[in-house]
Amino acid sequence: YDFTNCDFEKIKAAYLSTISKDLITYMSGTKSTEFNNTVSCSNRPHCLTEIQSLTFNPTAGCASLAKEMFAMKTKAALAIWCPGYSETQINATQAMKKRRKRKVTTNKCLEQVSQLQGLWRRFNRPLLKQQ
């Protein structure tokens, strides 16, 4: 999916009002010095591409993020504010249902969510214009 035509300001508002708080809840008890951000993004469409990948694609050691509250709210925000996003996700959702697993918060998942917070932070940053 090409995130170029999303309403970035509306997604940002949704993130600040709810999604960010769910991410904090998920990470509660984790030291703020524990993880360095290693996943990066260069502009808002790129950030959303990386956010979608980390949130919804199972990775080795962390298969369960898509069922978390922050993930469901992320999917809703993208569906509302990115034209045509919902249609591209129908097949992915059906595939997801076939491989549902028990919720387990592993250290790998905590690291992945810390990377997500970093990606969202880059997405939210003001446009950095060099004078």
Partner: antibody
Framework: QVQLVQSGAEVKKPGASVKVSCKAS????????IEWVRQAPGQGLEWMGI????????YYAQKFQGRVTMTADKSTSTAYMELSSLRSEDSAVYFC????????????WGQGTTLTVSS | DIQMTQSPSSLSASVGDRVTITCRAS??????LVWYQQKPGKAPQLLIY???NLQSGVPSRFSGSGSGTQFTLTISSLQPEDFATYYC?????????FGTGTKLEIK
């Protein structure tokens, strides 16, 4: 807990330079931008610029372009702001601040460093 | 650069009063606005981010509203510790300019 500790007060002569330090602790230093803000006596807040400690990328307010240099030392988790060609109007309290978790504000601030420029 | 104008520049009020401070941006900044409180000799403290989100640990008597070019900070019932100077700052694009400030004094 998160802390930003700045260097002590400075007295400089016009034309000189000053380098203010801001030592960060309690968080992953390279994950968050640092901004610098100053406040002249009895005046409001004035944004000077920001630095990305990870990449070293900087963004300066036009007013300070050519006179300000922001750097960061990852090994000591310290950000620096150097201001050159000082004039009396640069007398102010200089603050560093850390970007918030969400990237939509600056949530922790240093205690401030007082600079006096006088001949 | 985006200019931020606050009004009033100063305001006298009593404990228990409801107080409203306004911040106007020279162009559309959507919801990219923060509010700070500053007391004499201290660093600013973050109150509100994203125009309406209350920073953790800030009392619920503080609230923010608005979007686009017009924003408001409201203190529902003034407490003695609320007498300070308040600044808005836009977070849309660099330079991240501050408002002119509003000094809240005891009547």
């Amino acid at each position: 807990q998160v802390q930003l500790v700045q260097s002590g007060a400075e007295v400089k002569k016009p034309g000189a330079s000053v380098k203010v330090s801001c030592k960060a602790s309690g968080y992953a230093f390279t994950n968050y931008l640092i901004e610098w803000v100053r406040q002249a006596p009895g005046q409001g807040l004035e944004w000077m610029g920001i630095i990305n400690p990870e990449s070293g990328d900087t963004y300066y307010a036009q007013k300070f372009q050519g006179r300000v240099t922001m750097t960061a030392d990852k090994s000591t988790s310290t950000a620096y702001m150097e201001l050159s060609s000082l004039r009396s109007e640069d007398s102010a309290v200089y603050f560093c601040a850390k970007e918030s978790l969400t990237g939509s504000s600056y949530d922790y601030w240093g205690q401030g460093t007082t600079l006096t420029v006088s001949s | 650069d985006i200019q931020m104008t606050q009004s009033p520049s100063s305001l006298s009020a009593s404990v228990g009063d409801r107080v409203t401070i306004t911040c106007r941006a020279s162009e559309n900044i959507y919801s990219n606005l923060v509010w700070y409180q500053q007391k004499p000799g201290k660093a600013p403290q973050l109150l509100i981010y994203g125009a309406r989100n209350l920073q953790s640990g800030v009392p619920s008597r503080f609230s923010g509203s608005g979007s686009g070019t017009q924003f408001t900070l409201t203190i529902s019932s003034l407490q003695p510790e609320d007498f300070a100077t308040y600044y808005c700052q836009h977070f849309y694009e660099t330079p991240l300019t501050f408002g002119t400030g509003t000094k809240l004094e005891i009547k």
